[in-house]
């Protein structure tokens, strides 16, 4: 055993001076040699029979929510299904896991990335990566040309997740789409109305929504010379300038892609604007851009979803910004992304650089490619990065040392005196029976201090509290927790008065 | 059990050159790590070089690096130390040492020694 | 390089006493240190790696303690065959380097 335990102790020595070089950025080989030690170490250390045979933990990139995480992540929800429903969308749901075929094509390099099952009696079948590419399917395979759903539940991604950012291999997106034939432009700017609404209630801090499209970048490439077999890794590099420098992103564009100089100039020239419609009017005027009828289309449209966001009162928080170049493989028009101008970070605390938090555009092309006939549905759609959300929620609570009601109990029935589980247990029931969240201590005879003690931990506003005089008078006594303050209450009242109370509808409609 | 046993030791002039051996047995020889730790008259000890079991890694103490070289015969179960441009303060007891748990940096098992005398 | 600095030097003591003898490092180590046992015209003898590990076969009266910059080596009750040179070893980084020795001498 003691031999047994010093090689554990070499084992995590090594792992720590392993650790220790990739941080100081020590020689290839030194670090090559002392992992290879590290490996050596851990193979004479075999398997402990002693201890379990696998180490409890939740599979990478996955965790548990606790029910303070719960209590955060159901308030973001209803913020966000809320708004859903007030822009009059249904909701669907689909399974878990598709055919692979379904999922096959539709997301280019990132294919890579999808979860497959082993066989499962001859169906090949892959967890979804998203919600969209099944909402297309759904569209095609029950014919429908008109929906407006959403929907939320978890995806899967064979990502290396930083999960301290918000990122997970099993994460939720809430989605939102409109499909159908519309006139140009009035369901992309409810889109972007609905984003901005949710970002917005959910208080995360101040964002930008960043809008391209397609058809302009498209457009764009050609113009300044482009090949169309470049097309997409050169997107890649253009998408990079809201992290590094455009000397960089050249750098990288004739470096690495073979681009011609004076071609990633005349990229550079376009993709470092930004703007408002004032850039939309100045690109329809440049002679080269709107002479490309990709580029037009897409400009008069940008055009036109301006005005409509002016109306929607939320054109101060879109910028049109032409290096917006990311999730194209599907995308045929407009695309968006909401970006934090800056986390809310207290004193002292890092900012949690959780990049985007929601992202969307429109997609015309999808439902065709599962249609025998390739019939189209145009489509148009959103999707909030909860788990982003989630962490900074959870960080700003931390950081404010904020309570947060992880259950919603509106009254204990507590006793006073000895042998009163009988009556506790009817009171309960009754309120139950009346729509009252209400709770009582499994104990027989509970002293009063840790009934109210409990009450004070798990932030429950009333205690109902049953006593031999209060039964001879029929009354209960009702106690606020926070002002301590007791009143009588006629039995026959105690469920109307809890409900006005705790602002609760007095009946359950 | 395991064993190690220098040889080559003897007396050379400075400039001279010398090759000391260390026999092993007992042991998976190729597994190992094997160091050179070289110990002058009543004085302290030295780690002078050392190599790893697949014969990948090698290093040597500045005061030896450009005239020592370590190397191993894992068919032969044998260590060498080539010792060129010899100076008087090379003269030593050298051992040859078996890092413990193949690869951590600390003889576990040690040879008898071989003495170096390095005079004019 | 990493210096060890060992003290004392040298010490004085009868069978039956606790001896401690401390290693210093220039830098910190964390637990890569080991301690070494020599008798005149003999190879040392290795008594305790990363820093408490007793080396199998060694008496448990011989315990090791310490991480970072500061170790010990402690003979719990000292018996004759323990008369020697004590010397500890850094194992962090090449070139890996050795204290000055302690004599452990009878009083």
């Known amino acids: 055993m003691a031999e047994r335990a010093a090689l554990e102790e070499l084992v995590k020595l090594q792992g720590e001076r392993v650790r220790g070089l990739k941080q100081q950025k020590a020689s290839a080989e030194l670090i090559e040699e002392e992992v290879a030690k590290l490996l050596k170490l851990k193979a004479q250390l075999g398997p402990d029979e002693s201890k379990q045979k696998f180490v409890l933990k939740t599979p990478k990139g996955t965790r548990d929510y606790s029910p303070r995480q719960m209590a955060v992540r159901e308030k973001v929800f209803d913020v966000i299904i809320r708004c859903f429903k007030r822009h009059g969308a249904e909701v669907i749901d689909t399974p878990v896991f598709e055919l692979k075929e379904t999922l096959m094509g539709k997301y280019g390099e990132d294919s890579k990335l999808i979860y497959d099952l082993k066989d499962q009696g001859g169906e090949l079948l892959s967890l979804r990566y998203d919600l969209t590419v099944p909402f297309a399917r759904y569209l095609a395979m029950n014919k429908l040309t008109n929906i407006k759903r959403y929907h939320i539940a978890k995806v899967y991604r064979r990502d290396n997740p930083a999960m301290t950012r918000g990122r997970y291999r099993e994460f939720y997106q809430c989605d939102f789409d409109i499909a159908g034939n519309f006139d140009p432009m009035i369901p992309d700017a409810e889109c972007l109305k609905i984003m901005c609404e949710i970002l917005s209630s959910l208080q995360i801090g101040d964002f930008l929504v960043k809008v391209n499209d397609r058809r302009i970048l498209d457009g764009m490439f050609a113009i300044c010379g482009v090949s169309d077999s470049k097309f997409r890794t050169i997107c890649s590099s253009v998408d990079k300038l809201d992290k590094v420098s455009w000397e960089e992103v050249k750098n990288e564009m004739v470096g690495e892609k073979g681009l011609a100089p004076e071609v990633a100039d005349r990229i550079g020239d376009y993709v470092q604007q930004h703007g408002g419609v004032s850039l939309v009017e100045q690109l329809l005027q440049d002679p080269k851009l709107s002479q490309n009828k990709q580029a037009l289309e897409g400009l008069g449209d940008l055009k036109l979803l301006f005005e409509y966001l002016t109306l929607f009162g939320i054109d101060d928080k879109i910028s049109f910004d032409l290096s917006l170049a990311r999730g194209l493989d599907y995308y045929t028009g407009v695309i968006y992304e909401a970006v934090l101008l800056q986390t809310p970070a207290q004193a002292g605390e890092e900012p949690l650089g959780v990049g985007s938090v929601a992202a969307g555009g429109r997609y015309d092309g999808l439902v065709g490619m599962f249609d025998p006939k390739g019939r189209k549905v145009p489509c148009v759609g959103l999707s909030i990065g909860v788990e982003r959300i989630f962490s900074i929620v959870e960080q700003r609570l931390e950081a404010l040392e904020e309570k947060i009601r992880t259950t919603e109990t509106q009254v204990l029935v507590a006793s006073a005196q000895k042998k009163l589980l009988e009556e506790r247990l009817k009171l309960v029931s009754e309120l139950w029976d009346a729509g009252i969240k209400a709770e009582l201590l499994y104990k027989k005879n509970p002293k009063l201090l840790n009934q109210l003690q409990y009450c004070e931990e798990a932030g429950i506003p009333l205690v109902a509290i049953i006593g031999e005089q209060e039964l001879k008078d029929g009354v209960i006594k009702l106690r606020s927790v926070t002002s301590r303050e007791e009143v009588d209450v006629r039995r026959e009242d105690l469920v109307e008065e809890i409900k006005r109370r705790t602002g609760q509808p007095l009946c359950i409609c | 059990q395991v064993q190690l046993v220098e040889s080559g030791g003897g007396l050379v002039k400075p400039g001279g050159s010398l090759r000391l051996s260390c026999a092993a047995s007992?042991?998976?020889?190729?597994?190992?790590?094997m160091t050179w730790i070289r110990q002058a008259p009543g004085k302290g000890l030295e780690w002078v070089s050392y190599?790893?079991?697949?014969?990948?890694?090698?290093d040597y103490a500045d005061s030896v690096k450009g005239r020592f070289t370590i190397s191993r015969d894992n068919a032969k179960n044998s260590l060498y130390l080539q010792m060129n441009s010899l100076r008087d303060e090379d003269t030593a007891v050298y051992f040859c040492?078996?890092?413990?748990?193949?690869?951590?940096?600390?003889?576990?098992?040690w040879g008898q020694g071989t003495l170096v005398t390095v005079s004019s | 390089d990493i210096q060890m600095t060992q003290s004392p030097s040298s010490v004085s003591a009868s069978v039956g006493d606790r001896v401690t003898i401390t290693c210093r490092a220039s830098?910190?180590?964390?637990?890569?240190l080991a301690w070494y046992q020599q008798k005149p015209g003999r190879a040392p003898k290795l008594l305790i790696f990363?820093?408490?590990s007793l080396q199998s076969g060694v008496p448990s009266r011989f315990s090791g303690s310490g991480s970072g910059t500061h170790f010990t080596l402690t003979i719990s009750s000292l018996q004759p065959e323990d008369f020697a040179t004590y010397y500890c070893?850094?194992?962090?980084?090449?070139?890996?380097?050795f204290g000055q020795g302690t004599k452990l001498e009878i009083k």
């Open positions: 040492a078996r890092y413990v748990y193949q690869v951590v940096a600390i003889g576990d098992y």
């Open positions: 007992g042991f998976t020889f190729s597994d190992y790590y």
């Open positions: 190599i790893s079991g697949s014969n990948a890694y090698t």
């Open positions: 830098q910190g180590i964390s637990s890569w």
């Open positions: 990363a820093a408490s």
């Open positions: 070893q850094q194992a962090k980084s090449f070139p890996y380097t």
